[in-house]
Interface confidence: low
């Protein structure tokens, strides 16, 4: 799915109001320095691509994120604010239902959600340019294009 045409400000509002808090709840009891962020993103569509992948694609050691509260709210936000997104997810959702058996919070899942927090942070504030300051100056932003 191409996230270029999403309403990024609406998704950001959803993140700030609820998704961020659900991620914190999931990570409660985990030190913020426990995991190193290894996944990054350079612009908002790229961030959403990585967020969707980490949230909904089962990985080795963590197959159980898709039914978490933050994941359901992420899915809802993408479905509402990204044109055509929900249609692309129907088959994926069916596969997910079959794959899911029980809820287990593994260390691998905690690490994955820590990566998600980093991606959301970057999405929320990709570059200073996002604030629309007339004084904006950027000395090395060669490859980061932002779509509003």
């Amino acid at each position: 799915y191409d996230f270029t045409n999403c309403d990024f400000e609406k998704i950001k509002a959803a993140y700030l109001s609820t998704i961020s808090k659900d991620l914190i709840t999931y990570m409660s009891g985990t030190k913020s320095t426990e995991f190193n962020n290894t996944v990054s993103c350079s612009n908002r569509p790229h961030c959403l691509t990585e967020i969707q992948s980490l949230t909904f694609n089962p990985t080795a050691g963590c197959a159980s994120l898709a039914k978490e509260m933050f994941a359901m709210k992420t899915k809802a936000a993408l479905a509402i604010w990204c044109p055509g997104y929900s249609e692309t997810q129907i088959n994926a959702t069916q596969a997910m239902k079959k794959a899911r058996k029980s809820k287990v919070t593994t260390n691998k899942c905690l690490e994955q959600v820590s990566q998600l927090q980093g991606l959301w942070r970057r999405f929320n504030r990709p570059l200073l340019k996002q604030q629309g300051s007339s004084d904006y100056k950027d000395d090395d932003d060669k490859h980061h294009h932002h779509h509003h």
Epitope: L16, G118, R121, R125, L127, L128, K129, D135, Y136, D141
Partner: antibody, heavy 121, light 105 residues
Framework: EVQLVQSGAEVKKPGASVKVSCKAS????????MNWVRQAPGQRLEWMGI????????SYNQKFKGRVTITRDTSASTAYMELSSLRSEDTAVYYC??????????????WGQGTTVTVSS | EIVLTQSPATLSLSPGERATLSCRAS?????MHWYQQKPGQAPRPLIY???NLASGIPARFSGSGSGTDYTLTISRLEPEDFAVYYC????????FGGGTKVEIK
């Protein structure tokens, strides 16, 4: 533990420039903005400008436009604020303040200890 | 530029009393942050995004408001609460209020 350590006090003559440094540790320097805020004796806090260490983007308070330049050295995890054409009313304590975007509205959650700049002939 | 006006400029109260500090914006803002500053020290975050307590801040501090009017409340003043309090907004660049000094009566 997040720490912002600023350079020492400076005494400058009117018309000169001053460059204050702010060394960050305890977090990934490029992950958050860095603000510069000053406070003249007995006065309110005054925002001067901001830099995104991630890409070097800057935004300045119009009051200081043309006189203030904020830069960063990512390899040293250090932000700099240079103020030129100093006048006596620039005598103040200058703070760097990290801005965390996890909070709605981008809050300044950690502050340097402050650098006193005195402008006097 | 959004101008933040804090009132009163000085609040004279006794320990144990309730303090209500006001911050009014010249136009609507999304959120307000509050900081505490003691003489010779850097500001310390108190309240993030209108109503969220910063780390290590006791529950006697609370924030509320929306639009142009925001309030910081200290339910029962402790001796260490006597300081200057600043509000700060982000909606248009960043600006601080003029501060409210809470002093011992």
């Amino acid at each position: 533990e997040v720490q912002l350590v600023q350079s020492g006090a400076e005494v400058k003559k009117p018309g000169a420039s001053v460059k204050v440094s702010c060394k960050a540790s305890g977090y990934t320097f490029t992950d958050d903005y860095m603000n510069w805020v000053r406070q003249a004796p007995g006065q309110r806090l005054e925002w001067m400008g901001i830099i995104s260490p991630y890409n070097g983007g800057t935004s300045y308070n119009q009051k200081f436009k043309g006189r203030v330049t904020i830069t960063r050295d990512t390899s040293a995890s250090t932000a700099y604020m240079e103020l030129s054409s100093l006048r006596s009313e620039d005598t103040a304590v200058y703070y760097c303040a990290r801005e965390d975007y996890d909070y709605d509205g981008y809050a300044m959650d950690h502050w340097g200890q402050g650098t006193t700049v005195t402008v006097s002939s | 530029e959004i101008v933040l006006t804090q009132s009163p400029a000085t609040l004279s109260l006794s320990p144990g009393e309730r303090a209500t500090l006001s911050c009014r914006a010249s136009s609507s803002v999304s959120y307000m942050h509050w900081y505490q500053q003691k003489p010779g020290q850097a500001p310390r975050p108190l309240i993030y995004a209108t109503s969220n307590l910063a780390s290590g801040i006791p529950a006697r501090f609370s924030g509320s408001g929306s639009g142009t009017d925001y309030t910081l409340t200290i339910s029962r003043l402790e001796p260490e609460d006597f300081a200057v309090y600043y509000c700060q907004q982000w909606s248009s660049n960043r600006t601080f209020g003029g501060g409210t000094k809470v002093e011992i009566k």
